[in-house]
């Protein structure tokens, strides 16, 4: 029979190169059965993960999977870093793997670098 444990799935692509000033949605894929768990986002700061309290979030329900979304409207340079979502369900805490955002500041990039440029010039990601 199908397990009804809450699962925080992973996305194959766990790194995102994005441009400051653009909108962006960070998705936390969640599987649950009857009761939707309480899910939160946090940002990694060294070994601790700082809870993001006052950020816009939403749920998107799909057939096989649900997504708890952290909205960046717009992306800011200091959004650069690693994020993790956590689910509270029946007093159990489940943590996801981390997802990393590499933010390019528009002030230092006259135009959006291509994917190839990102790969060949990783310093662009941190400028």
């Amino acid at each position: 029979k199908e397990s009804c444990d809450v699962q925080l799935y992973i996305k194959r692509q766990s790194e995102h190169s994005i441009l400051a000033g653009d909108p962006f949605e960070l998705e936390c894929p969640v599987k649950y059965c009857a009761n939707r768990p309480h899910v939160t986002w946090c940002k990694l700061n060294g070994t601790t993960c700082v809870k993001l309290e006052d950020r816009q979030t939403s749920w998107k329900e799909e057939k096989n999977i649900s997504f708890f979304i952290l909205h960046f409207e717009p992306v800011l340079p200091n959004d650069n870093g690693s994020y993790r979502c956590s689910a509270n369900f029946q007093s159990n805490l489940i943590e996801s793997h981390s997802t990393t955002l590499y933010v390019t500041d528009v002030k230092s990039a006259s135009e959006r670098p291509s994917k190839d440029e990102m790969a060949s010039r990783p310093w662009l990601l941190y400028s």
Epitope: Q7, I10, K11, R12, E95
Partner: antibody, heavy 128, light 109 residues
Framework: QITLKESGPTLVKPTQTLTLTCTFS??????????VGWIRQPPGKALEWLAL???????RYSPSLKSRLTITKDTSKNQVVLTMANMDPVDTATYYC????????????????????WGQGTTVTVSS | EIVLTQSPGTLSLSPGERATLSCRAS???????LAWYQQKPGQAPRLLIY???SRATGIPDRFSGSGSGTDFTLTISRLEPEDFAVYYC??????????FGQGTRLEIK
């Protein structure tokens, strides 16, 4: 029936580059959900994952070895090639390739079926 | 990076006994991504369990997996002589996608 077989040199000198080939049959590396991984095992030690290539040419590397590794695939030849630069005696190990299968929905991995078939392994000694 | 710690390092039992092998993750792992392997001397590893509890093709039902979060268990209900080997747990993640435990050696008492 899925089979994989590793081939490459048995002896490599320090600082040289190792090139290993995984030749497989029974599946296509252009089929969605399929991957091939490389794993090594030094004598008497535990398994260590090295690299992974997916059907869509997405590649993943062990963070500690990323700068030395390159994985490529040739779908028409049913081969995956791993190169490892700047070999050192500590890289002496048996190197395995393995078939991996996942189910993905909108980029989300909803099932991982493990490394379900492995090659027999090839032993590589690094020595001058 | 998620670290998998297996215990005990060595388990000495007799044929017919029950074996319980533990795998503890440094951070919670979805059971979807947890697998177990058996390796005999001079052979490649063999997949036993995937998804924490699903038996791979051809694996006898004396092998079972369980657990969630950070604690996972491989149980062999009645040990057969051919079950004495090294067992590894493995998780599939995002960065890095694959990590193995250090192994548990199951030896004949």
């Amino acid at each position: 029936q899925i089979t994989l077989k590793e081939s490459g040199p048995t002896l490599v000198k320090p600082t040289q580059t190792l090139t290993l080939t995984c030749t497989f049959s029974g599946f296509s590396l252009s089929t969605s959900g399929v991957g091939v991984g490389w794993i090594r095992q030094p004598p008497g030690k535990a398994l260590e994952w090295l690299a992974l290539i997916y059907w869509d040419d997405d590649k993943r590397y062990s963070p500690s070895l990323k700068s030395r590794l390159t994985i490529t695939k040739d779908t028409s030849k049913n081969q995956v090639v791993l190169t490892m630069a700047n070999m050192d005696p500590v890289d002496t190990a048996t190197y395995y390739c393995a078939h991996i299968r996942i189910t993905e929905v909108r980029g989300v991995i909803i099932s991982y079926y493990g490394m379900d078939v492995w090659g027999q392994g090839t032993t590589v000694t690094v020595s001058s | 990076e998620i670290v998998l710690t297996q215990s005990p390092g060595t388990l000495s039992l007799s044929p017919g006994e029950r074996a319980t092998l533990s795998c503890r993750a440094s951070q919670s792992v979805s059971s979807t991504y947890l697998a177990w392997y058996q390796q005999k001397p001079g052979q490649a590893p063999r997949l036993l369990i995937y998804g924490a509890s699903s038996r791979a093709t051809g694996i006898p039902d004396r092998f079972s997996g369980s657990g969630s979060g950070t604690d996972f268990t491989l149980t062999i209900s009645r040990l057969e002589p051919e079950d004495f080997a090294v067992y590894y747990c493995q998780q599939y993640g995002s960065s890095p996608p694959i990590t193995f435990g250090q192994g548990t050696r199951l030896e004949i008492k």
